[in-house]
Interface confidence: low
Amino acid sequence: HNTTVFQGVEGQSLQVSCPYDSMKHWGRRKAWCRQLGEKGPCQRVVSTHNLWLLSFLRRRNGSTAITDDTLGGTLTITLRNLQPHDAGFYQCQSLHGSEADTLRKVLVEVLADPLDHRDAGDLWVPGESESFEDAHVEHSISRSLLEGEIPFPPTS
């Protein structure tokens, strides 16, 4: 699995989407977990409804919510009030018994809110070719891991 980057702005919401084959994963609950260290376990953050047929209902754990479009095959995770400590590696998982298949590896990147770092002069707006280190900075943008990186969150 390649890693997909989702960028969000500190203090705002970030929506992470994980597409999957709806037939292959029919009847399976889904989960969102945080990778603890490079070789460590993936710690469950939130999972979809216990009843698969109710997976469309939003479930929440703190500032993280999850909902599953089982027909369309898209798992959506929303991180509210994004904070720097939310940055790190995560996984979308499909659960079957005690096993979990990885649907997508995700790197969440938290950008400083430009308004919190405004210069005395005019607010600088990036040009069209601007990048986060060359990547367009938008809310909730996702891409392959081409620019920018955040190491695994500290485990201590």
């Epitope: 400083a112 770092h117 600088w124 990048s131 990186e149 955040i150």
Partner: antibody
């Protein structure tokens, strides 16, 4: 402590290819970008490209696009830079350098460098 | 690409004196996240470059406090308050706000 150890000097003929390796230790190799930078005799440092070992994703400077391939073997914590269709102007010391990025906005600077690999292109 | 231009190309300073190196970029190095990714590297004869200053003014670990960086936008300065013999070498400014990363042509520091 962080260490980057590069392969030895190479002498190549024009038109040939060269592959330089960079073995990393002392940090989580797969979660920091690795850059390649070269320095021709008496010239400024020149950025070639970089790789994110955890995903295999790469960026290259336009000047080298199509002629350079940067790869990484996470199991061996080693990055590679292969340059093809060599010409005399490619004679330079080639460096690998880790790009530090601990948190958003933290650094994006090359904090540790390999010892350099001299590549000489001569007929 | 962002072009980095340093001045002077070389300078000779007496031990204990102050050295100032300037760096100008062809476009603003302020990133859309408001940070400025301008760094300074030192390369001693026969050695690999070493990171001195990152993000304009932050000294890298182990770098003596006689080294300081300043500037904003497109104009930046590296100062060595009291030059020591071990400071001899070439100093490069570099930007990582935009890919491709680019370096200045270098400033050679010598002792008078």
């Amino acid at each position: 402590q962080v260490q980057l150890v590069q392969s030895g000097a190479e002498v190549k003929k024009p038109g040939a290819s060269v592959k330089v390796s960079c073995k990393a230790s002392g940090y989580a190799f797969s979660s920091q970008w690795m850059n390649w930078v070269r320095q021709a005799p008496g010239q400024r440092l020149e950025w070639i490209g970089r790789i994110y070992p955890g995903g295999g994703d790469t960026n290259y400077a336009g000047k080298f696009q199509g002629r350079v391939t940067i790869t990484a073997d996470t199991s061996a914590s080693t990055a590679y830079m292969e340059l093809s269709s060599l010409r005399s102007e490619d004679t330079a010391v080639y460096y690998c350098a880790r790009l530090l990025r601990n948190q958003p906005g933290e650094s994006y600077a090359m904090d540790y460098w390999g010892q350099g690999t001299l590549v000489t292109v001569s007929s | 690409d962002v072009v980095m231009t340093q001045s002077p190309d070389s300078l000779a300073v007496s031990l204990g004196e102050r050295a100032t190196i300037n760096c100008r970029s062809s476009q603003s190095l302020v990133h859309s996240n408001r940070y400025t990714y301008l760094h300074w590297y030192q390369q001693k004869p026969g050695q690999s470059p070493k990171l001195l200053i990152y993000k304009v003014s932050n000294r890298f670990s182990g770098v003596p406090d006689r080294f300081s960086g300043s500037g904003s936008g497109t104009d930046f300065t590296l100062k060595i308050s009291r030059v020591e013999a071990e400071d001899v070498g070439v100093y490069y400014c570099s930007q990582s706000t935009r890919v491709p990363y680019t370096f200045g042509q270098g400033t050679k520091l010598e002792i008078k």
